[in-house]
């Protein structure tokens, strides 16, 4: 098959800061560009960014998390708590440009979502959110 | 429709599974006005880290 | 690593049907689209439709419609297009392309259909 | 639907020469444009997503770029597997649709 895989990594963002929290094999990815998209969990930004030709983001950065040894824990060894999210948009209709992070479709509706969880989660314990997978309902 | 699926980050400590749920739930229909999403079906659960790459895709409700 | 392996060759009659398969292998979970596009003899690339593997959405391109179906089996993780009214002009080799965070990212090794009285 | 005029349809370079392709949309269509690389006999390999990201493997002599509707792919110093046919591929609406393709020739 053509290509070739890369590793995935989940970039936290809230505020204009991001927390990187990177798996193996390391994503040449960055927090300031869309992921490879050889990645199966594209990194998504929970931030408001400015779109550019190249559509990159910009934010300032701060150090990778690093993972517990505790691989049960939800938690990182910085104290950081995941949660999994699942919901429908029963007024939106899915295609297949909500693949795609370079498309407008899937930027605007990132960016909603984003907005709207930097809304519901105002307080101070809320660092952002990643991995952002849209399918259809 | 379109299904949404993503991780949210706290600090440990900060929230549970419930409280993340119960917030959501709270802003669904503000939601609907200000951002014209019509929110339903919402499931939240405890990501273990390190999460796999593939952790959150077999949450298929 | 992924892959994604496509059935064997076909040699097909006009006003037949062909059925190809597009395999993924090298990842475990069944939540991404698979595009489907043509290549005829010494010619360019042509996008036929899209499925989401697992879910019963597709888009078609017009050209196509009402002469192509795409299905899919999310248990053994392969995705299926089937071409009807086979005509000389379908003959081509027919490619499938896997999403992974982007469009088109994998391709399939390709089905060569040849259409033939 | 949307068209992608891509030029020159062929051309004939040496190995180390700088070499660019153009493809040119009918309409706006962002940043959402594909470059596949594909050797006779072969499958399409993607060489560069979202107009200008390099894929994962993919050598840094290639780099996409873009200026209003017009889509530049540019190797830098051409080396001998290199020579193929080169597409775009835009994906800003369906139906999806590909340049007519460039051959790149050995000189």
């Known amino acids: 098959a053509s290509g070739s895989a890369s590793g995935s990594a989940s970039t936290l963002v809230h505020n204009g800061t991001s927390a990187r929290a990177t798996t193996t094999p390391a994503s040449k990815s960055t927090p300031f560009s869309i992921p490879s998209h050889h990645s199966d969990t594209p990194t998504t930004l929970a931030s408001h960014s400015t779109k550019t030709d190249a559509s990159s983001t910009h934010h300032s950065s701060v150090p990778p998390l690093t993972s517990s040894n505790h691989s049960t824990s939800p938690q990182l060894s910085t104290g950081v708590s995941f949660f999994f999210l699942s919901f429908h948009i029963s007024n939106l209709q899915f295609n297949s440009s909500l693949e795609d992070p370079s498309t407008d479709y899937y930027q605007e509706l990132q960016r909603d979502i984003s907005e709207m969880f930097l809304q519901i989660y105002k307080q101070g314990g809320f660092l952002g959110l990643s991995n952002i997978k849209f399918r259809p309902g | 429709s379109v299904v949404v699926q993503l991780t949210l980050a706290f600090r440990e400590g900060t929230i549970n599974v419930h409280d993340v749920e119960t917030q959501f739930n709270q802003y669904k229909t503000e939601a609907a006005s200000r951002y014209n999403l019509t929110i339903s079906d919402v499931s939240v659960s405890d990501v273990p880290f390190p999460f796999s790459a593939q952790s959150h895709h077999h949450h298929h409700h | 690593e992924v892959q994604l392996v496509q059935s064997g060759a076909e040699v097909k009659k006009p006003g037949a049907s062909v059925k190809v398969s597009c395999k993924a292998s090298g990842y475990t979970f069944t939540s991404y689209g698979i595009n489907w596009v043509r290549q005829r003899p010494g010619q360019g690339l042509e996008w036929i439709g899209y499925i989401y593997l697992g879910s019963d959405y597709t888009e078609y391109n017009e050209k196509f419609k009402g002469r192509v179906t795409l299905t899919s089996d999310t248990s053994a993780s392969t995705a299926y297009m089937e071409l009807s009214s086979l005509r000389s002009e379908d003959t081509a080799v027919y490619y499938c392309?896997?999403?992974?965070?982007?469009?088109?990212?994998?391709w399939g090794q390709g089905t060569l259909v040849t259409v033939s009285s | 639907d949307i068209q992608m005029t891509q030029s020159p349809s062929s051309l004939s370079a040496s190995v180390g020469d700088r070499v660019t392709i153009t493809c040119r949309a009918s309409q706006d269509i962002g940043i959402t444009l594909n470059w596949l690389q594909q050797k006779p006999g072969k499958a399409p390999k993607r060489l560069i997503y979202a107009t200008s990201s390099l894929d994962s493997g993919v050598p840094s002599r290639f780099s996409g770029s873009r200026s209003g509707t017009d889509y530049t792919l540019t190797i830098s110093s051409l080396q001998p597997e290199d020579f193929a046919t080169y597409y775009c591929l835009q994906y800003a609406s369906s139906p999806y649709t590909f340049g007519g393709g460039t051959k790149v020739e050995i000189k």
């Open positions: 392309a896997r999403s992974a965070g982007s469009l088109f990212a994998y």
